[in-house]
């Protein structure tokens, strides 16, 4: 017989990440005969759904179907028709929906019900919509980056896939920042944990992993900003809030009802003598940093060591991949380079925050003002969270790698979620027979 390539049997999977600020649809593909190998699944498409997160549709659920249409139609185009019926579709909702569920389980269920009905109308194998836990979000993010970095592979490669990949099998920790929550997940040096709530055990590809994880609800960048505003308005003498986290010359009116809408601001809620207040930016990094630090309660710790708010955190260990908003924000600020020290990042932030709003608008004319106005806060928040929240130091800063994609796949929880639900991460190392992956006859 001739060495003729057989047509590859390709499988597809779809995961929708229903985040607090938006929904993204990811399409993954892999060779069917290699589905238990590590690193064979890769992302072929990301489609960002136009509009806010699904939790914002609670009063207009009849619009959910239309909201999801474009990206689902895109999936219909990308995936060959012959594969539609066997392509699983999963939707995982994160902290935005966790917060809605805290306010009203009935309303959260209504949104999920309509989402499920809408998605079931497509010709795929719809596997349901659910709110994933913070622990799952952390764990699946950790699985994703280590899967993509080849950390579960027993084959040592003589080449390096990505600049920060080392050939050792030490896993990377995962730092995930969303709009409403943030997760930290890593394998600590010490296998015994003081807090069982934060402990996960995995057996992946024949190896045991004892993983620490925690998800801080309300400490995503958007909810952290609402918290900070609610805290600071308490001590404002009138309806003007001079805010160091916004550029000099920036002005914005905020409704008090919007401020207190989220459960994240409940601890700061008080009766104010006004319905609205105006943020006036003064652009001072140091003051902004101080204000942000007040969101982290570090005075109480029932363990040997804590992050903040009395949550156990073991000593940091190894390299960390920081993704999602950690990456988006730092990438916008041009601070993702491995060569930029923590001191340099702080310097750059000071400079950026002090730039006048008019100047910023001119320099970044293509960026939506709503997002543009918040980069000073977000950058400051990221530094505060990593340094004071998680106890990274100037030295350990170089172990943080700001990652957008690995091998063309977005870093985030979605790939890990799909790998788990499709049983593509075996507990034991698959036996690789010499001819098992041959595509030639």
């Amino acid at each position: 017989t001739q060495n003729k390539a057989l047509p590859e049997n390709i499988k597809y999977g779809i995961v929708l990440d229903a985040g607090s600020s938006h929904t993204s649809l990811y399409i993954y593909k892999w060779p069917a005969e290699k589905e238990n190998d590590t690193g064979v699944v890769h992302q072929v498409e990301e489609c960002r759904v136009k509009g806010p997160g699904i939790s914002k549709y609670v009063q207009k659920v009849n619009e959910i179907g239309i909201y999801l249409t474009d990206c689902m139609e895109r999936a219909r185009e990308v995936i060959p028709r012959s594969q539609h019926q066997e392509t699983p579709v999963y939707l995982g909702a994160t902290a935005g929906m966790r917060l809605l569920r805290m306010e009203s389980e009935e309303l959260a269920d209504r949104v999920l019900d309509v989402v499920e009905r809408s998605l079931s109308n497509y010709p795929f194998d719809f596997q349901g919509a659910r709110i994933i836990t913070g622990q799952e979000e952390g764990a699946y993010g950790w699985i994703t980056i280590n899967y993509l970095l080849g950390k579960f592979s027993q084959k040592t490669r003589w080449f390096s896939i990505v600049p920060y990949e080392t050939n050792n099998q030490e896993t990377f920790g995962a730092l995930d920042l969303g709009g409403a929550s943030t997760q930290i997940t890593f394998v600590p040096q010490n296998q015994t944990t003081e807090s069982p709530d934060n402990a996960l055990q995995f057996r992946l590809y024949g190896k045991d992993y004892n993983v620490y994880t925690h998800s801080f609800l309300c400490y995503g960048k958007d909810q952290a900003l609402w918290q900070k505003l609610a805290k600071d308005i308490q001590v404002a003498s009138n309806e003007i809030l001079r805010d160091p986290c916004f550029h000099p010359g920036y002005k914005k009116v905020v409704n008090v009802s919007d401020l207190y809408k989220t459960p994240c601001t409940k601890r700061f809620e008080m009766t104010l003598p006004f319905q609205q207040f105006e943020i006036q930016g003064i652009g001072n990094y140091q003051q902004c940093h101080q204000s942000v630090l007040e969101l982290f309660n570090t005075s109480y710790c029932p363990y040997s060591q804590c992050a903040f708010n009395g949550i156990f955190l073991p000593p940091l260990q190894g390299d960390f991949g920081a993704f999602s908003a950690f990456y988006f924000v730092m990438n916008f600020l041009n601070l993702t380079s491995e060569k930029v020290s923590q001191e340099k990042v702080t310097e750059m932030m000071k400079k950026f925050c002090s730039q006048p709003w008019e100047e910023i608008k001119t320099s970044y004319a293509g960026v939506k003002e709503k997002y543009l106005s918040e980069y000073c806060f977000s950058g400051t928040y990221i530094l505060s969270l990593l340094l004071q929240g998680y106890h990274f130091t100037a030295d350990s800063w170089e172990h943080i790698h700001f990652i957008g994609k690995i091998q063309g796949s977005d870093a985030g929880w979605t790939l890990g979620y799909m790998l788990n639900l499709t049983n593509m991460i075996p507990a034991e190392q698959p036996l690789s027979t010499p001819l098992s992956h041959s595509t030639y006859v």
Epitope: N62, D109, R110, D113, V114, E116, R117, S120, Q127
Partner: antibody, heavy 121, light 107 residues
Framework: QVQLVQSGAEVKKPGSSVKVSCKAS????????ISWVRQAPGQGLEWMGS????????NYAQKFQGRVTITADESTSTTYMELSSLRSEDTAVYYC??????????????WGQGTMVTVSS | EIVMTQSPATLSVSPGERATLSCRAS??????LAWYQQKPGQAPRLLIY???TRATGIPARFSGSGSGTEFTLTISSLQSEDFAVYYC?????????FGGGTKVEIK
């Protein structure tokens, strides 16, 4: 106690359409989903689709996509199921049934009496 | 879609005896499973939901058990009015799917 009352039996020609109604009485209508299930003579139950009358949101079994349309009229507490391009295999009793809950709670706790649809040339 | 398989197709039982009906799902449905009874010329009637909770007005002789992929409907002591066809249905995911039914007939 909620009751679902369906329209009467129909005899239809192949290629035509049929529209069956289901009127709810004696309870709240809009907050529940209404499913349509059919049963061919001597066969089992087959789910066709569902609607939340309050929002007009419908979803359908893939088998019937493009051929079935489920609608609701809140003012009369009536749900409709229209099946087009009828063929002899569509001869069946068509039931409407109330879904008792919301998210992942689609047990069917109240059923209509059924509507016999015969497709014959 | 989730495929529901019922066994046996027909069950011959004497009045007063116990009847055990099985239902298997092609993937886990948790406890999102219902059982229905249907008599000739009538609409189905909900007996059990949540795999084991009896619906309003259903006699205690009907009981459901199981979770995940394996479910059982037990009729502890068959009465004459219990001879009928029984269907299981999963309601975890769309499309809602029914088993093929088990006919319980008089032995």
């Amino acid at each position: 106690q909620v009751q679902l009352v369906q329209s009467g039996a129909e005899v239809k020609k192949p290629g035509s359409s049929v529209k069956v109604s289901c009127k709810a009485s004696g309870g709240t209508f809009e907050s529940y989903g209404i499913s349509w299930v059919r049963q061919a003579p001597g066969q089992g139950l087959e789910w066709m689709g569902s609607i939340i009358p309050e929002f007009g949101i419908a979803n359908y079994a893939q088998k019937f996509q493009g051929r079935v349309t489920i609608t609701a009229d809140e003012s009369t507490s009536t749900t409709y199921m229209e099946l087009s391009s009828l063929r002899s295999e569509d001869t069946a009793v068509y039931y409407c049934a109330r879904e008792s809950g919301g998210y992942r709670d689609h047990r069917l706790d109240v059923w209509g009496q059924g509507t016999m649809v015969t497709v014959s040339s | 879609e989730i495929v529901m398989t019922q066994s046996p197709a027909t069950l011959s039982v004497s009045p007063g005896e116990r009847a055990t009906l099985s239902c298997r799902a092609s993937q886990s449905v948790g406890s999102n499973l219902a059982w229905y009874q249907q008599k000739p010329g009538q609409a189905p009637r909900l007996l059990i939901y949540g795999a084991s909770t009896r619906a309003t007005g259903i006699p205690a002789r009907f009981s459901g058990s199981g979770s995940g992929t394996e479910f059982t409907l037990t009729i502890s002591s068959l009465q004459s009015e219990d001879f009928a066809v029984y269907y299981c249905q999963q309601y975890l995911l769309w499309p809602l799917t029914f088993g093929g039914g088990t006919k319980v007939e008089i032995k």
